[in-house]
Amino acid sequence: HHHHHHASQPCPYPMAPPNGHLSPVQAKYILKDSFSIFCEPGYELLQGHLPLKSFAAVCQKDGSWDQPMPSCSIVDCGPPDDLPSGRVEYITGPEVTTYKAVIQYSCEETFYTMKVNDGKYVCEADGFWTSSKGERSPPVCEPVCGLSARTTGGRIYGGQKAKPGDFPWQVLILGGSTAAGALLYDNWVLTAAHAIYEQKHDASSLDIRLGALKRLSPHYTQAWAEAVFIHEGYTHDAGFDNDIALIKLNNKVVINSNITPICLPRKEAESFMRTDDIGTASGWGLTQRGLLARNLMYVDIPIVDHQKCTAAYEKPPYSGGSVTANMLCAGLESGGKDSCRGDAGGALVFLDNETQRWFVGGIVSWGSMNCGEAGQYGVYTKVINYIPWIKNIISNF
């Protein structure tokens, strides 16, 4: 560092800024001598408002330093990001956002739960709010799924009227023919591929309604589709194998007691979907009167043995192989309880006895020519077979 040119005048003796130190320390600094400034942890080099990673000044021949002394300013992480469907609380003190300050994120109770971490973040020396797991991005408030106001009641022939909050995941899809779907998370709808196939290239034409009880009621939450994803294995007009689709909504919907997503089945879900276990289908489809229902209706129906269902659809007018391993059947052998045209795409749901949450086991897909026919059953897309497909699309889009 020493380059002694006796003719040159020394530079002013540098004083380290508060919370910083200077190196190397010399008795005097002359031409071409330099010094660096290092800040204590939690402090950053700033020249005015501009941050620096490192600082070194060189003594010039006119006896001045080539650049001004920086400051060591306490790191300020700035206001933390807002948390959609949640809030942030300043723990250290009101609006304190500097080094070592602590904030606590929390989600709106009842309808949202925190994903990723415990919500506690600290302002670290690098200037980022950081969780105990080292994450810099804020946590996510994920909607609680499978909540219903319904207490399983007596089964009424053909179905009964739903009450507010009974099927808060129920989605009404208009734009082609009347169809249904089920809300997943807060911006996806699970439905049947055949129900929205005609709109697959015109997602914006789908009129999606949530939180509705009466089909024609003006009281609902409007949503619009951003994109439609039809299972690549589904072939229109060639049976109903892989009859599953996802609709991405262009905005997240606000979750409340009337709009709540359905859960996807856990690995263990098959234990709640054995033969004779009861599932519930809901929709505004054709009733016994042959008209679309005004009020959202539901029916509790048992799962039917797969072989029995396969056999039921092997005799004319049905062709063999109609019922595949990607389907499940539900209904009464005696008939009278079923889903019907207009219910397509809706969820057949089951109660998970361990979590006490409802999950989607089936998607209303197809059935006999005459709904509720004795010896015939409603056929549903078996959702558990498509969990990887669903999760892949949702995580990538």
Partner: antibody, heavy 118, light 108 residues
Framework: DVQLQESGPGLVRPSQSLSLTCTVT?????????WNWIRQFPGNKLEWMGY???????SYNPSLKSRLSITRDTSKNQFFLQLNSVSSADTATYYC???????????WGQGTTLTVSS | QTVLTQSPAIMSASLGERVTMTCTAS???????LLWYQQKPGSSPKLWIY???KLASGVPVRFSGSGSGTSYSLTISSMEADDAATYYC?????????FGAGTKLELK
Amino acid sequence: DVQLQESGPGLVRPSQSLSLTCTVTGYSITSDYAWNWIRQFPGNKLEWMGYISYSGRTSYNPSLKSRLSITRDTSKNQFFLQLNSVSSADTATYYCAIISTAVDFDYWGQGTTLTVSS
Amino acid sequence: QTVLTQSPAIMSASLGERVTMTCTASSSVSSSYLLWYQQKPGSSPKLWIYSTSKLASGVPVRFSGSGSGTSYSLTISSMEADDAATYYCLQYNRSPLTFGAGTKLELK
């Protein structure tokens, strides 16, 4: 030699989002300094929009904060500007720049002209 | 925010003439954090003076800068044709960084 090069669409419709890229050669954007976006309106007025620092932290002009996002891709040595809900008032030449008092370390791109029009 | 007011907005000078333009801040600015830029039509601004009075590399010694607090100036001791341009002051003492509206210097 350090060089900064802006790239962008040239024309954006009102209410849409504007995305610009600044590609830096000759110096790593993680090595030091603040990497700024500045715009110059047709009447030649200059406005500082914001920066992303070597560490990835951002600072925005309060007048734009609600519409502005500056991000980076360190693997490509690029930083980006996204300005939402643009209007004709956002018509300007956009510069990326490194502003510094370090001797001979102040560099600007050549600018990219953006017109907001339907 | 700190507003920088430059005056005059436009001026003209003859070859060899002494030229002074000013930059006035609405609140005090550290002299360490005041810069001047030169810009010619069709080009990006170029750093001209930093820390109020230090000339950027390649800037002729006929240029000088001075000032403190809220009052700063750029002076050309003897105008040359190549000096015709617009000059902007910039403060980065505090956020947001702000520019003056510029002084356009023309050759008379």
